[in-house]
C-alpha cells in the first residue's frame, strides 16, 4: 500500500472524518489540501487500497492569479446506501513530484438495527409432520440474539435462549404464523411473518375393494388433518401406458387424468364406465378447508374381463343334404376381453340340442345325422371370453341351398343398446 513520506510537510489541511451509521445511510468524506502549482489528482484509499471506481468529486480553487500560486483542492467521496463492504479506514492520497502523501485516516463504521440475511418463508406442511424454519440476522453491532414467535407468542423465555438460526417444529395441527425478532444493542428488528398452512396428510393404503369389468371400487385410509375436517377426497385414474413410468409415482402421466370427487366419509369410491380388461393407474388426495394433501403414489389396477355384450353378427346358415354350412362375423358390441372362440348350437323340432365349441373360426360345416330329413333346424351362435359366454344369437333357420342363389344372411338380433364408451367417463 502507498505510504506517505515524511521528507516534506504534508499538503493536507483537512482530513476525512468518521461516519458511523445504519445500513442505507448516505454520507460524505472530505479531504482538503493546499499545493503550489498544478493541482494533483486526489485518490481515495480504503484500508490502504486505491478505490478505482470511487464516487468522488474534486474541486480546485486558485489562491492567486498565477498558475504557480497556491491552490486549494477539495475531494469529496460520496458513500450512498452504506453497506458492510463500505466499512473501513479511508484516506486521501496524492502524488506530488516524486513524493506520495497520504492524509490522516477517517473511519466508516456500520452500526444499526439487526439486518436479516434470511427470514422464515411461507410453506405448507402436512398435519403433525416435523419441519424446520430458518432465520438469520447480523449487526453490527454484534451479538444479535434471536427470539422465535409462533402466532405472536415467544417460543423461548428470552432472546438468545431458544433456537437461533434454525427452528425445529415437531408438527402442527393448525395453520400458524412464525416470525423471529432480532435483538442487538441498537434495537429490535422483526422478520416477515411466515404462514405455515397445515394440509391433510397423504392418504394411506389405497386399495381395491371389488372389481367388475366396467367398474372398480376402491378404498383408502385418510391421513391426519389437524383441527380441519376433510371436506372431500379426489381420485384420479389414467389408462396405463408402458412408456409412462408411473408405477414409481413419477412423473405425472402425459394425458389428462380422469378425476372424480368422493364425499367423506366413507373413504371409498366406485369408479364406473371403465374399459373392461384394461390396466389403469389410480391415486387419491384428500382436501380440508386449508387445501389438498399430496397425492398417493400411483397404484396399478386392472378391470377384469367381461363376457361379450352382443352376439356374433351376420350369421348365414344353409343346408345341402346332410351338410349344413354356417358362418358369421365377430360381434360388433364390445367383447369386454380377449375373444377365445365361439359356441354353436343347433336343434331340430323334435330332436335334442347339439352344442359345439368352434374355437376362433368363423365358419363351420355340420354333418347332420340321418338323411337330413329333420325339420325346422335352427342354429344359434355365441362368442365367449375367459369370463364366459356372451348372449346367443336369435335362432337362424337352416335353409335349403339352391344352386345359383346367394346364401341367405340373417340379421340376428336388434342392435343391442350398449353404453357409449367415451372419455371422460364420470
Amino acid at each position: 500500500a502507498p505510504r506517505g513520506t515524511q521528507a516534506e510537510e504534508s499538503p493536507f489541511v483537512g482530513n476525512p472524518g468518521n461516519i458511523t451509521g445504519a445500513r442505507g445511510l448516505t454520507g460524505t468524506l472530505r479531504c482538503q489540501l493546499q499545493v503550489q502549482g498544478e493541482p494533483p489528482e486526489v485518490h481515495w484509499l480504503r484500508d490502504g487500497q486505491i478505490l478505482e471506481l470511487a464516487d468522488s468529486t474534486q474541486t480546485q480553487v486558485p489562491l492567486g492569479e498565477d498558475e504557480q500560486d497556491d491552490w486549494i483542492v477539495v475531494s469529496q467521496l460520496r458513500i450512498t446506501s452504506l453497506q458492510l463492504s463500505d466499512t473501513g479506514q479511508y484516506q486521501c492520497l496524492v502524488f506530488l513530484g516524486h513524493q506520495t502523501f497520504v492524509s490522516q485516516p477517517g473511519y466508516v463504521g456500520l452500526e444499526g438495527l439487526p439486518y436479516f440475511l434470511e427470514e422464515p418463508e411461507d410453506r405448507t406442511v402436512a398435519a403433525n409432520t416435523p419441519f424446520n424454519l430458518s432465520c438469520q440476522a447480523q449487526g453490527p453491532p454484534e451479538p444479535v440474539d434471536l427470539l422465535w414467535l409462533q402466532d405472536a407468542v415467544p417460543l423461548a423465555t428470552a432472546p438468545g435462549h431458544g433456537p437461533q438460526r434454525s427452528l425445529h417444529v415437531p408438527g402442527l395441527n393448525k395453520t400458524s404464523s412464525f416470525s423471529c425478532e432480532a435483538h442487538n444493542a441498537k434495537g429490535v428488528t422483526t422478520s416477515r411473518t411466515a404462514t405455515i398452512t397445515v394440509l391433510p396428510q397423504q392418504p394411506r393404503n389405497l386399495h381395491l375393494v371389488s372389481r367388475q369389468p366396467t367398474e372398480l371400487e376402491v378404498a383408502w385410509t385418510p391421513g391426519l388433518s389437524g383441527i380441519y375436517p376433510l371436506t372431500h377426497c379426489t381420485l384420479q385414474a389414467v389408462l396405463s401406458d408402458d412408456g409412462m413410468g408411473i408405477q414409481a409415482g413419477e412423473p405425472d402421466p402425459p394425458e389428462e387424468p380422469l378425476t372424480s370427487q368422493a364425499s367423506v366419509p366413507p373413504h371409498q369410491l366406485r369408479l364406473g364406465s371403465l374399459h373392461p380388461h384394461t390396466p389403469y393407474h389410480i391415486r387419491v388426495a384428500c382436501t380440508s378447508s386449508q387445501g389438498p394433501s399430496s397425492w398417493t403414489h400411483w397404484l396399478p389396477v386392472e378391470t377384469p374381463e367381461g363376457v361379450p355384450l352382443g352376439p356374433p353378427e351376420n350369421i348365414s346358415a344353409t343346408r345341402n343334404g346332410s351338410q349344413a354350412f354356417v358362418h358369421w362375423q365377430e360381434p360388433r358390441a364390445p367383447l369386454q376381453g380377449t375373444l377365445l372362440g365361439y359356441r354353436l348350437a343347433y336343434q331340430g323340432q323334435d330332436t335334442p340340442e347339439v352344442l359345439m365349441d368352434i374355437g376362433l373360426r368363423q365358419e363351420v360345416t355340420l354333418e347332420l345325422q340321418g338323411d337330413g330329413s329333420v325339420s325346422n333346424l335352427t342354429v344359434c351362435v355365441a362368442a365367449y371370453t375367459a369370463a364366459g359366454d356372451g348372449p346367443w344369437s336369435l335362432p337362424v333357420p337352416l335353409e335349403a341351398w339352391r344352386p345359383g342363389e346367394a346364401q341367405p344372411v340373417h340379421q340376428l338380433v336388434k342392435e343391442p343398446s350398449t353404453p357409449a364408451f367415451s372419455w371422460p367417463w364420470w
Partner: antibody
Framework: QVQLQESGPGLVKPSETLSLTCTVS????????WGWIRQPPGKGLEWIGY???????SYNPSLKSRVSISRDTSKNQFSLKLSSVTAADTAVYYC???????WGQGTLVTVSS | DIQMTQSPSSLSASVGDRVTITCRAS??????LRWYQQKPGKAPKLLIS???NLAAGVPSRFSGSGSGSDYTLTISSLQPEDFATYYC?????????FGQGTKVEIK
C-alpha cells in the same frame, strides 16, 4: 462497549423496600430483556426476574408478591424494588442482560436494623 | 418449578486434568441450558449457551453436551485460571433456576 452499573443503598432496614437501579450504556434497553439476579453471601445464584424490551415483566414466583421491575427508557435504566425485606434478602444483587453476555459488577445489599 | 441438581458440589483437581461437571433437571429442558463460571467477588461469566454452544471469547477447552434432562460441562485440560465455581441455569421455563454450584479447587 456495553456496561451495566447497579446503584442504590447498601443497607436497608427490615420490612422496608429495597430499591436498586441499573444504568446501561452501549446497549439500548428497548432491545432484549433485562434481569436481576442475587447471590446471598457464600451461597448460589437466584433469579429474581426480568423486564422485556417492550416493558412486560416476568418474576420468580417465590418473590412475586414483593418484587417489581420497571424501566426508564429515556435514561436507559431499569430498576428493582423488593418490599418487606428481611435478613434473608441480604445478598449481592446483579443486573444483567438476560443473554448474560453483560453483567453489572454487583452491589451488596444488607438488610439490618 | 424445575429443579437443577448439580454434581459434584466441589472437586479437587490439578492443572492439566480433565474435569466433568453434571447438571440434572427435574424434567426435560430441551437444551435450554447455560453454564457459568464465577470467581470470588466477580459477576458470573457465560461459558456455554444452548447446552453446547461456546460463548464468544471462551477457550475451546470448555465444552458442553447433553440433552433431555442430563447435561455435562467438560474442561478438557484444566488451567490455573479455571479454578472457580461453575453454575448451570435452565431457561426453559419461568422461573429460571440455577444449579447449586460446583467449586473446582486446586488439589
Amino acid at each position: 462497549q456495553v456496561q451495566l452499573q447497579e446503584s442504590g443503598p447498601g443497607l436497608v432496614k427490615p420490612s422496608e423496600t429495597l430499591s436498586l437501579t441499573c444504568t446501561v450504556s452501549g446497549y439500548s434497553i428497548t432491545s432484549n430483556y433485562w434481569g436481576w439476579i442475587r447471590q446471598p453471601p457464600g451461597k448460589g445464584l437466584e433469579w429474581i426476574g426480568y423486564i422485556t424490551y417492550s416493558g412486560s415483566t416476568s418474576y420468580n414466583p417465590s418473590l412475586k408478591s414483593r418484587v417489581s421491575i420497571s424501566r426508564d427508557t429515556s435514561k436507559n435504566q431499569f430498576s428493582l424494588k423488593l418490599s418487606s425485606v428481611t435478613a434473608a434478602d441480604t445478598a449481592v444483587y446483579y443486573c444483567a442482560i438476560t443473554t448474560f453476555y453483560y453483567w453489572g459488577q454487583g452491589t451488596l445489599v444488607t438488610v439490618s436494623s | 418449578d424445575i429443579q437443577m441438581t448439580q454434581s459434584p458440589s466441589s472437586l479437587s483437581a490439578s492443572v492439566g486434568d480433565r474435569v466433568t461437571i453434571t447438571c440434572r433437571a427435574s424434567q426435560d429442558i430441551g437444551n435450554y441450558l447455560r453454564w457459568y463460571q464465577q470467581k470470588p467477588g466477580k459477576a458470573p461469566k457465560l461459558l456455554i449457551s444452548g447446552a453446547t454452544n461456546l460463548a464468544a471469547g471462551v477457550p475451546s477447552r470448555f465444552s458442553g453436551s447433553g440433552s433431555g434432562s442430563d447435561y455435562t460441562l467438560t474442561i478438557s485440560s484444566l488451567q490455573p485460571e479455571d479454578f472457580a465455581t461453575y453454575y448451570c441455569l435452565q431457561s426453559k421455563e419461568s422461573p429460571w433456576t440455577f444449579g447449586q454450584g460446583t467449586k473446582v479447587e486446586i488439589k
